[in-house]
Amino acid sequence: PLATIPVSTTSLTSSEGSTISTPSVDISTPVTTSIVGDQCSRCKNGGFWDGLKCQCLTPYYGESCEEVVNSIDIAPPETVSAQMELTVTVTSVKFTDELKNHSSQEFREFNKTFTEQMNIVYSGIPEYVGVNITNLRLGSVVVEHDVLLRTKYTPEYKTALDNATEVVKQKITKVTTEQIMTNDNCSALMCFNTTGTQVQNITVTQYDPVEECRQKAEEYEDYFLVEYRDQKPYCISPCESGFNASKNCNHGKCQMSQNGARCLCVTTETHWYSGEDCNQGTQKSHHHHHH
């Protein structure tokens, strides 16, 4: 037997001006119905019946997953990072075969000294996390390594990380120019070959809240947008109140459709409202407008 779905009706006026009796289901929303056994479930738009209620897919909600949410949760990462692949040539250490083996005592000692040296070099960079040696090779010791940078996510995180990578380049260039061997001796913790410093590659975390918002909004992607509050991104439709892009429906209800946000104007005992923003009120008895 088919389940009957009670549909409440509300007397609303569309922004064109004619009074409509509309079900709470948005008739312009594509409706797909899920069937559980031989029972016709009330879950629409890809939602599924869990035995008690509809589990709706983003961006839908409601008893039957018939309504579109006003805001979608987007979760930017707490921190964002960058990885710089660098090569420097250490001249104050002679390469030995033991350095090829990452589990040897020699490698561990070199790693410790090199890390200490780089921690000194990059000490003024708040985004600096550390270094990771990826390879050591002959010449005296050519050190292929990653410089790791991290910062809190903000809308300007790319600029912050880009600036940090520039400072890394400046600092490593400076130290490898200044800390050089004199008469075959090094007075610093490590000495370098000035010409052996190279930045091979820079990888920065890619996070785009606009892209995440559009993806989650699915067929409503053109109508959801990202606004920031306290440097946190919010994925909202114009029906969400309190934002710059919020639609003011005055005497009406904002509702999302595939054509965007629209105002469904209310009719009260004394007035009926019309206009795109339901701001044109007409008194039923006197028929005069007031704005």
Partner: nanobody, 123 residues
């Protein structure tokens, strides 16, 4: 575990000689770098000399021609022969070692250290 033990310090008159020894245990004697450092009262620790596993040596300008560093890989021993000693050579002398073939007398580059032996040059 690497252990370094110095000996041979003492009181000597200006112009005299002393031979310091350092016995290394747990250290792969055929590898790395061994060095002598010294610290005079109220002064920073400074590098005196170092010797690599292949016998390559280097000296601080202030001791060149007067001090000689040597090592015996088979005995895991390090020596510092000090001649023509001066009052300014008075200090605690430390033996230090690194598993790496180093070309630096920067103390921070040496992870292994002895307790030190006192050398006093006075008349």
């Amino acid at each position: 575990d690497v252990q370094l033990v110095e000996s041979g310090g003492g009181l000597v008159q200006p112009g005299g000689s002393l031979r310091l020894s350092c016995a290394a245990s747990g250290f792969p004697s055929s590898r790395g770098t061994m060095a002598w450092f010294r610290q005079a009262p109220g002064k920073e620790r400074e590098g005196v000399a170092f010797i690599n596993s292949d016998g390559r040596t280097s000296y601080a300008e202030s001791v060149k021609g007067r001090f000689t560093i040597s090592r015996d890989n088979a005995l895991s021993s390090l020596w510092l022969q000090m001649n023509s000693l001066r009052a300014e050579d008075t200090a605690v002398y430390y033996c230090a070692a690194s598993l790496l073939y180093l070309m630096t007398v920067n103390a921070a580059a040496y992870p292994y250290w002895g307790q030190g032996t006192m050398v006093t040059v006075s008349s």
